[in-house]
Amino acid sequence: EEELQVIQPDKSVSVAAGESAILHCTVTSLIPVGPIQWFRGAGPARELIYNQKEGHFPRVTTVSESTKRENMDFSISISNITPADAGTYYCVKFRKGSPDTEFKSGAGTELSVRAKPS
């Protein structure tokens, strides 16, 4: 069986301030078991945007029913975008454990924020 891949098809997305941004992410396998997390940026300074497992992420909604066992689409929508949201977003698969460990990351999607049209 082929190893899981995390696919972020869009290299970049541009959104006007105040609008919503859709960031696409799919995985190619249900194995290994474990949650998806979204981050803005890479390395230790990265910001947690969404954690499928726990937490309260009011501006983020999942595009599909990510809680379904067979789901492989982990795309998200971020509402009310501001300039501070600009950056590269990574969809990251974790392997279930105590604690969960990072398994594989997508290539990233760069979000740029345009001025709100007047």
Partner: antibody
């Protein structure tokens, strides 16, 4: 219910150090950025520092940069502020504040810890 | 760096009357503005976020309006327990996070 409880305040002399703690409960601490905000006697609110959810990203106000260090222990649900080379102008009540989401407002505040720097 | 200017510095209002507080940003902050209430000797408390949304447990006599650079907090019928300092906070551009200088609401 969300609770934020600061401790570690006190009276110190200029140039000395102090470490504040903020014990958090009632929410998923490791999922939220946290902040320190201070208020000098009779003055308004001044943002001091921010730390991202994982602890690897930090920001500071220019007035404390190089002297204060923010950190967190997600296993203990605790936020810290290490304050070195304290000055009289650092005298204030220090509040820890939870951030609603990573790029958002402060939705819960602690009761505050008083730090007095005086010779 | 965005500067927030609150006016008036002090507002004296009779119980049951309307109080109108203003917060002006030096550049657009979209709808990313919050209002916090601080009663004497207490910690701040979130009242309004995203310019118009009331936080959990906040009475409906508090309302927020505005977008861009001009924002208003309205207390429709002032109660004695509303005596406090009110601060606006922007979170459109950061760091640093900025607060306004505050408006003190006194009961006549």
């Amino acid at each position: 219910d969300v609770q934020l409880v600061e401790s570690g305040g006190g009276v110190v002399r200029p140039g000395e150090s102090l470490r504040l703690s903020c014990a958090a409960s009632g929410f998923s601490f490791s999922s939220h950025a946290m902040n320190w905000v201070r208020q000098a006697p009779g003055e308004g609110l001044e943002w001091v520092s921010r730390i991202n959810s994982g602890g690897g990203g930090t920001d500071y106000a220019e007035s404390v940069k190089g002297r204060f260090t923010i950190s967190r222990d997600n296993s203990e649900n605790t936020l810290y502020l290490q304050m070195n080379s304290l000055r009289a102008e650092d005298t204030a009540v220090y509040y820890c504040a939870k951030q609603y989401d990573w790029n958002g407002f402060f939705d819960y505040w602690g009761l505050g810890a008083l730090v007095t720097v005086s010779s | 760096e965005t500067v927030l200017t609150q006016s008036p510095a002090t507002l004296s209002v009779s119980p049951g009357e309307r109080a109108t507080l203003s917060c002006r940003a030096s550049q657009t902050v979209g709808s990313k503005l919050a209002w916090h209430q601080q009663k004497p000797g207490q910690a701040p408390r979130l009242l309004i976020y995203d310019a118009t949304n009331r936080a959990t447990g906040i009475p409906d006599r508090f309302s927020g309006s505005g977008s861009g650079t001009d924002f208003t907090l309205t207390i429709s019928s002032l109660q004695t327990e509303d005596s406090a300092v009110y601060y606006c906070q922007q979170y459109y551009y950061w760091p640093p996070y900025r607060f306004g200088g505050g408006t003190k609401v006194e009961i006549k």
